[in-house]
């Protein structure tokens, strides 16, 4: 069941999904200039079997302008260095041995995608919160939000996170800071991935997220 | 008690446009998104997109992508729906519903009729 | 896109007749909602989460089911009951109701 609503927004912190309930939907959105493809798919869905849980279409972006050709999903080898791929490989190899039952990781990119990524989750998923740099957490609780549905409405639960400013940079017990810009990252403030103009953050963010969780979650 | 009211009928031409207007009051606007459903005339309920008031954000039924255009002014608590280069097919009653999960209050509906 | 299909699309019953409405989606999905509409007048909710009344609606409607094959049961017809029932899946976009199923005087 889609949840009808938005993780919950938290003063100088950013939110990430470590892994897709089944179910998830993530749109194919492609940016300036291009377009999804006339045969595509609107949305990838997380969708699984008992022992594998796995992404259902895949999106693709031509130009605008170009009548009948397709881009193809996989990034060609100029694109990896923009895209940071190496960089956000090596730092997904510790999630990457992880894999929750039901669940779906993290999509690859594809060519021409959009800046930002857009998901709608479903009821039973749990997004994490983190400070962005220059901020520190003050914990009273899990830094992290549940979707749950009472009565047929959905809600997530409140992160008892509370990002203060200070001078040192944030760190998570055992995470090294990411690689954020100066002036951080803007809030999130639909369900999406960090809402970022630069992919190469956002990748860079996420997948360092995404091995912390998966370091402490698991403990 | 949370009410959703509708702006009146209307008649449109072919080609035209026209903006359906839905108020909400009893509840907090941004807290629910705002779910638009149509229904031609004899047929059945089609649900063609949410706007998210306090964010903007809109989601829309592919068939409904570049007909429908939602938006939404949170100093009125009002929700609004832009249909363009009406058709015959286009004449229906127009719905808003509260979101948040399953549509547990709707606006009276709204018919527009396009006719030459 | 997850097609609903309702059966049957008319029923024709008698006050104090159970009536039973079935509704089968394409795909499989977590619960099923329905809907009552009167003629002129907006749906209203009456079941969701498959099996949950909504608030002021008789016990004599029920709601069962899952994966894709769901049913709305009213136990014994009541006059105010004759009227059109609409299932309605959000378990993907986009959302899709059945085409309905008309109660109507036999």
């Known amino acids: 069941e889609l949840c009808d609503d938005d993780p919950p927004k938290i003063t100088h912190a950013t939110f990430k999904a470590v892994a897709y309930k089944e179910g998830t939907m993530l749109n194919c959105e492609c940016k300036r200039g291009f377009r999804r493809i006339k045969s595509g798919s609107p949305y990838m869905l997380c969708t699984g079997n008992s022992s594998h849980s796995s992404w259902d279409n895949q999106c693709q972006c031509t130009s605008s302008a170009a009548r009948n050709t397709t881009k193809q999903v996989t990034p060609q080898p100029e694109e990896q260095k923009e895209r940071k791929t190496t960089e956000m490989q090596s730092q997904m190899q510790l999630a990457d041995q992880v894999s929750l039952p039901g669940h779906c990781r993290e999509p690859p990119p594809w060519e021409n995608e959009a800046t930002e990524r857009i998901y709608h989750f479903v009821v039973g998923q749990t997004v994490y919160y983190q400070c962005v740099q220059g901020y520190r957490a003050l914990h009273r609780g899990p830094a992290e939000s549940v979707c749950k549905m009472t009565h047929g409405k959905t809600r997530w639960t409140q992160p008892q996170l509370i990002c203060t400013g200070e001078t040192e940079p944030s760190q998570f017990p055992g995470e090294e800071e990411p690689q954020a810009s100066p002036d951080g990252l803007p809030e999130s403030e639909t369900s999406r991935l960090v809402t970022t103009t630069d992919f190469r953050i956002q990748t860079e963010v996420a997948a360092t997220m995404e091995t912390f969780i998966f370091t402490t979650e698991y403990q | 008690q949370v009410q959703l009211v509708q702006s009146g009928a209307e008649v449109k031409k072919p080609g035209s446009s026209v903006k359906v207007s839905c108020k909400a009051s009893?509840?907090?606007?941004?807290?629910?998104?705002m779910h638009w459903v149509r229904q031609a005339p004899g047929q059945g309920l089609e649900w063609m997109g949410y706007i998210n008031p306090s964010s903007g954000y809109t989601e829309y039924n592919q068939k409904f992508k570049d007909k429908a255009t939602i938006t939404a002014d949170e100093s009125t608590n009002t929700a609004y729906m832009e249909l363009s280069s009406l058709r015959s097919e286009d004449t229906a009653v127009y719905y808003c519903?509260?979101?948040?999960?399953?549509?547990?209050?709707w606006g009276q509906g709204t018919l527009v009729t396009v006719s030459s | 896109d997850i097609q609903m299909t309702q059966s049957p699309s008319t029923l024709s019953a008698s006050v104090g007749d159970r009536v039973t409405i079935t509704c089968s989606a394409s795909s499989s999905i977590s619960y099923m909602h329905w809907y009552q509409q009167k003629p002129g007048k907006a749906p209203k909710l009456l079941i969701y989460t498959t099996s949950e009344l909504a608030s002021g609606v008789p016990a004599r409607f029920s709601g069962s089911g899952s994966g894709t094959e769901f049913t709305l049961t009213i136990s014994s017809l009541q006059p105010d009951d004759f009227a059109t029932y609409y299932c309605?899946?959000?378990?993907?976009?986009?959302?899709?109701f059945g085409q309905g199923t008309k109660v109507e005087v036999k």
């Open positions: 309605h899946q959000r378990s993907t976009y986009p959302l899709t």
């Open positions: 519903a509260r979101g948040g999960g399953v549509f547990d209050y």
């Open positions: 009893g509840y907090t606007f941004t807290s629910y998104r």
